[in-house]
């Protein structure tokens, strides 16, 4: 496609799906796309949905029953049954003693842990937020496939400059036939040119990414 | 008949280690508590490490903690005592005792003893 | 640790003399939950092991004689031979067994005249 067709031009019976990539961003915002027609009916992507959201369920009761069981094979070796039988008094005071300072043990150990996981929320969040902070400095546009003729798009996007560059495309028109293969080459040229002129190549970079 | 039969004691050097067993018949082993107690060649009686019945829980005196380790057997109906960095005044008759039912107190069966000599 | 202190260190009686024997513990073995004194005597003849005669202070072992008879509660103990046999020559020892470690007196030598 030649890329400077208005609104009035006939479409095409079924064009082929354009693949969404910058460099072929004028084509993309100027071809017209037949909506594709959705093959699954609404109740059979209800009941899909509702079928996904079983599985992930069952999936998540999984994981939690496995968590449950560590818990347990966890508990089961640190914490054995307690064998009193035969134990004299002064055993189970003794024991008692070991206990109470394994809890004490414990309880520091369970303290530095605490201290660490609030530790490492905290820099999480601060992450999570520089990322996001990051993301408002970038922000991507949300692309909207709108019919915009070719003339209209460089206006919007050069301003000024959009004469100078219509111009050099009237010419670039009016080149014969037999050249074809030398003003693809040097509509690519000028291509290149505009993109550098407007930032473009930062923006394209970003959008194939 | 309650029986505990030691065994495993003899002569060792300071420094040297040795391993005591104390085979145990005529009761319900793994549901008792199992002590070591010792008698010093001036008939004074020590106290050195109690194992419970499931080997969950023990006790040693200052004495020999560190030094020497108690254990059990429960499916062989054994007790196990490890002496390592032996000193002279380990030099004692090594008995195995059984501890009384869980209401009641003391050692109520002794074995006959095994000699440990730590000597150079 | 409790230290256990017996007197005297030896005694020599007759045949059917009645005899008295002392342990003391450097502290209370009374346990106030259940009123139990946690001491217990042994018996030791010669070339044997010792042999547990009295628990809890009081409570004879089952197939010790009734001539011997524990008292006493917190620190102060004694062990009475009501009438002395010859089979009970023996040295006669106390333990404690209050708390850990578990500590025995140094014992009394029962002697025959």
């Known amino acids: 496609a030649d890329g400077s067709s208005d609104a009035a031009r006939e479409p095409r019976p079924a064009p082929a799906p354009i693949r969404r990539r910058s460099s072929n961003y004028r084509a993309y915002a100027t071809e017209p796309h037949a909506k594709k027609k959705s093959k699954i009916s609404a109740s059979r992507k209800l009941q899909l949905k509702t079928l996904l959201l079983q599985i992930a369920k069952q999936e998540l009761e999984r994981e939690a029953e496995e968590r449950r069981g560590e818990k347990g094979r966890a508990l089961s070796t640190r914490c054995q049954p307690l064998e009193l039988a035969g134990l004299g008094f002064a055993e189970l005071q003794d024991l008692c003693r070991q206990l109470h300072a394994r809890v004490d043990k414990v309880d520091e150990e369970r303290y530095d842990i605490e201290a660490k996981v609030t530790k490492n929320i905290t820099e999480i969040a601060d992450l999570t937020q520089k990322i996001f902070d990051l993301r408002g400095k970038f922000k991507r546009p949300t692309l909207r496939r709108v019919r915009i003729s070719a003339d209209a798009m460089m206006q919007a996007l050069l301003g000024a400059r959009a004469k100078e560059s219509l111009d050099l495309r009237a010419h670039l028109k009016q080149v014969k036939k037999e050249d074809t293969e030398k003003e693809n080459r040097e509509v690519g040229d000028w291509r290149k040119n505009i993109d550098a002129l407007s930032g473009m190549e930062g923006r394209k970079k970003k959008f194939e990414s | 008949e309650v029986k505990l039969e030691e065994s495993g004691g003899g002569l060792v050097k300071p420094g040297g280690t040795l391993k005591l067993s104390c085979a145990a018949s005529?009761?319900?082993?793994?549901?008792?508590?199992m002590s070591w107690v010792r008698q010093t060649p001036e008939k004074r009686l020590d106290w050195v490490a109690t194992i419970s019945s499931g080997g969950s829980y023990i006790f040693y005196p200052d004495s020999v903690k560190g030094r020497f380790t108690i254990s059990r057997d429960n499916a062989r109906n054994t007790l196990y005592l490890q002496m390592n960095s032996l000193r002279s005044e380990d030099t004692a008759m090594y008995y195995c005792?059984?501890?009384?039912?869980?209401?009641?107190?003391?050692?109520?069966?002794w074995g006959q003893g095994t000699l440990v000599t730590v000597s150079a | 640790d409790i230290v256990m202190t017996q007197s005297p260190s030896s005694l020599a009686m007759s045949v059917g003399q009645k005899v008295t024997m002392s342990c003391k513990s450097s502290q209370s073995l009374l346990n106030s939950s259940n009123q139990k004194n946690y001491l217990a005597w042994y018996q030791q003849k010669p070339g044997q092991s010792p042999k547990l005669l009295v628990y809890?202070?009081?409570t004879r072992e089952s197939g010790v004689p009734r001539r011997f008879r524990g008292r006493g509660r917190g620190t102060r103990f004694t062990l009475t031979i009501s009438s002395v046999q010859a089979e009970d020559l023996a040295d006669y020892f106390c333990?404690?067994?209050?708390?850990?470690?578990?500590?025995f007196g140094a014992g009394t030598k029962l002697e025959l005249k």
């Open positions: 333990q404690q067994h209050y708390s850990t470690p578990l500590t």
């Open positions: 809890f202070a009081s």
């Open positions: 005792a059984r501890h009384h039912n869980p209401d009641k107190s003391g050692f109520a069966y």
């Open positions: 005529g009761f319900t082993f793994s549901s008792y508590a």
